[in-house]
Every structure is written in structure tokens, then in C-alpha cells.
């Protein structure tokens, strides 16, 4: 019988509040054997896929999605989902990315590195994703 797939987790490095023009990396985690990780933006209509998967621990794999230079348009809700044959997982909770004007001061506090919890993470709608893996990469509008 098919195994129950654990929900993926999502976090952001260095945090969820990012100065304009800085970089951010979303980190999705799931079990070993994930073939495709997908980062979804706001809704399922905009997403990026990767098959560049590596070990996060003996029992976990992870994928990273990097935005080199954050723009105001990158602000919003993000979540992860993964494909482990023969099916897709549920979505992770939402993570909200906030983009702030660069203050230029070195003392302006950002969200803690690796933060994925707290008020910026929202529950997903837990609806199931039935569409097939995007084996040819982007099948929708680019995230970034």
C-alpha cells in the first residue's frame, strides 16, 4: 500500500524580511526519495520546480530556491509541495516574504536567520494537489 507522505516544511534564509535588492533562499524539506520539490507562490498558478535534491539529515531531503535580487514584486506567500512517486504531498504551511526598503544601516534587525515560524507563517488551505509533476520544469509563470 502507498505510504503516507509527511507534509513538507518551508523556511527562508537569511529570514523572511528581506531588504530590497538582497538575496533570499527558500528551503523546502521532505523525506528521502523526493523527485521534485515545487515552490508555489500565492496560489498554484505560479511555481518553480527543482530536482536538485540533497540530504538534510539521514531521513530528510531538501531543495533550495534562490532569488538573487529581491524586488517588491517578490513579496507574498510561498509554500512547498513535493512529488514522491507515485503521488504529490500536501502543501506546507505558507511562509510570508516581506520586502523592505534598504535602510542602509547595519543595525536594522531582520528576521532571525532560517526563521520559518511566528506570525509570518500562515496555515495552508490543506487542499490536495492532483496535477502531475512538471517533468519539463516550469509549466506556469516564473516565480522570479
Amino acid at each position: 500500500q502507498e505510504e503516507d507522505l509527511p507534509r513538507p516544511s518551508i523556511s527562508a534564509e537569511p529570514g523572511t524580511v528581506i531588504p530590497l535588492g538582497s538575496h533570499v533562499t527558500f528551503v523546502c524539506r521532505g523525506p528521502v526519495g523526493v523527485q521534485t520539490f515545487r515552490l508555489e507562490r500565492d496560489s498554484r498558478s505560479t511555481y518553480n520546480d527543482t530536482e536538485d535534491v540533497s540530504q538534510a539529515s539521514p531521513s530528510e531531503s531538501e531543495a533550495r530556491f534562490r532569488i538573487d535580487s529581491v524586488r517588491e514584486g517578490n513579496a507574498g506567500l510561498y509554500r512547498c509541495i513535493y512529488y514522491k512517486p507515485p503521488k504529490w504531498s500536501e502543501q506546507s504551511d505558507y511562509l510570508e516574504l516581506l520586502v523592505k526598503e534598504s535602510s542602509g544601516g547595519p543595525d536594522s534587525p531582520d528576521t532571525e536567520p532560517g526563521s520559518s515560524a511566528g506570525p509570518t507563517q500562515r496555515p495552508s488551505d490543506n487542499s490536495h494537489n492532483e496535477h502531475a509533476p512538471a517533468s519539463q520544469g516550469l509549466k506556469a509563470e516564473h516565480l522570479y
Epitope: 533562499t25 528521502v32 523526493v34 530536482e51 519539463q136 516550469l138
Partner: antibody
């Protein structure tokens, strides 16, 4: 259909150089980590090098036996993988395979290109 | 580096029999283990990934089990094309190491 076609192998003298190429098709090259694996005549498999995607800053990893002599690189715009091999030794004689990662595992292999290092 | 100890180095069996190959990792690798087969003069082929998952298009007579440091690979009801060389590989940390191989021979 996934295809990985290696070229560039041949006969080279010790301390010489060679550049292997791998043309990829049938999949979205830029979302996959890629590897080179080699197999000496009559021997087992030896992982040589790995390169990750732009999301992972094109990070590279090497076997100790080739570190500082071999360089793995990729051209996502052309769906090409490369292995620049310098200061070659007789121990580097092997069949060299281009390998596509999937789920972190070696899911697709090219047919290989032979490299012979001999005086 | 993680060493992968594969056994036996060779094994004889008859058509229709079952065989089991073992791979031991020198440190825990969770389920970051793959099994490959290589036919003479051909490229290796992934059979099992994540220790237990069957790769695309691979017949169900192949199976994998184990986690941590001890792994097994089983072929039930051997067919003529199964008498080739099999390798395990850990993908937990670089260098990504292979076992030394098991040659399956027809009895």
C-alpha cells in the same frame, strides 16, 4: 526520452589534459544536479565529481583522487556538462559516464566515453 | 569518507531462484542508498533508490530494504538477464561511494 551523450575521450599522455563534454536532452537540464562517474577497465564504479544548480550556487564536489586536477562545469543555456581533466595520470584510465541526478540518486547514465592515459 | 562493504563478491544461482545481496555502510546513512545493475559493456542502471523505492520501469521482482547502516537487495525469480553485476551506493555525503560490486553467475 532522456539522452546523455559524452564526447571528448581518447588517448592522452601522462601529465596531459583532456576536456570531456556531455550533451543533455529530453529533460530540463537546469533543474538537475549532474555528475561524472568513471570505471577503470575490469573495475568497479567511482564517483568523480558533482555540480549543483544555480539555486545552489553551482556548488561543486570532487573525489579526493581528482581534486585540484579536474574541474566540473555546466552551461545551462546549451544543456551541456563538462569535465576538464589536467595533469592526467595512468590511474585516470577509465570509461567516463555523465550522470543525471534525480531525487539525489543517479537515475540516468550516458553511454560513456573512454579515456586512456598512456605514454 | 563512508565505506560501503558489499557482499558477496560473487554468487551462483539458478533460474527462478531468489538471491539477496547485502551492503553495509561504515556510518549511518538513513535511507540514502541506491542499487544499480550493470550489464556487460553497458552503462549502469538505477534499480532501487531511497533504499526501498523501485525506479521507473524496473520490474517488481527487484526489492530493497534496510536503513541506517545495513541494507539488502533481493531479486526473486531470477531471469536470464539478471546474471550481471550489481552495485550499491551511498548518497548521504560526498564522496559518494559505491560498493565493490556483486557478480551474479548462473549455476
Amino acid at each position: 526520452e532522456v539522452q546523455l551523450v559524452e564526447t571528448g575521450g581518447g588517448l592522452v599522455q601522462p601529465k596531459g589534459s583532456l576536456k570531456l563534454s556531455c550533451a543533455a536532452s529530453g529533460f530540463t537540464f537546469n533543474i538537475n544536479a549532474m555528475n561524472w562517474v568513471r570505471q577503470a577497465p575490469g573495475k568497479g564504479l567511482e564517483w568523480v565529481a558533482r555540480i549543483r544548480t544555480k539555486n545552489n550556487n553551482y556548488a561543486t564536489f570532487y573525489a579526493d583522487s581528482v581534486k585540484d586536477r579536474f574541474t566540473i562545469s555546466r552551461d545551462d543555456s546549451q544543456s551541456m556538462l563538462y569535465l576538464q581533466m589536467n595533469n592526467l595520470k595512468t590511474d585516470d584510465t577509465a570509461m567516463y559516464y555523465c550522470v543525471r541526478d534525480r531525487a539525489g540518486f543517479f537515475a540516468y547514465w550516458g553511454q560513456g566515453t573512454p579515456v586512456t592515459v598512456s605514454a | 569518507d563512508i565505506q560501503m562493504t558489499q557482499s558477496p563478491a560473487s554468487q551462483s544461482a539458478s533460474l527462478g531462484e531468489s538471491v539477496t545481496i547485502t551492503c553495509l555502510a561504515s556510518q549511518t546513512i538513513g535511507t540514502w542508498l541506491g542499487w544499480y545493475r550493470q550489464k556487460p559493456g553497458k552503462s549502469p542502471q538505477l534499480l532501487i533508490y531511497a533504499a526501498t523505492s523501485l525506479a521507473d520501469g524496473v520490474p517488481s521482482r527487484f526489492s530493497g530494504s534496510g536503513s541506517g547502516t545495513k541494507f539488502s537487495f533481493k531479486i526473486s525469480s531470477l531471469q536470464a538477464e539478471d546474471f550481471v553485476i550489481y552495485y550499491c551506493q551511498q548518497l548521504y555525503s560526498t564522496p559518494l561511494t559505491f560498493g565493490s560490486g556483486t557478480k551474479l553467475e548462473i549455476k
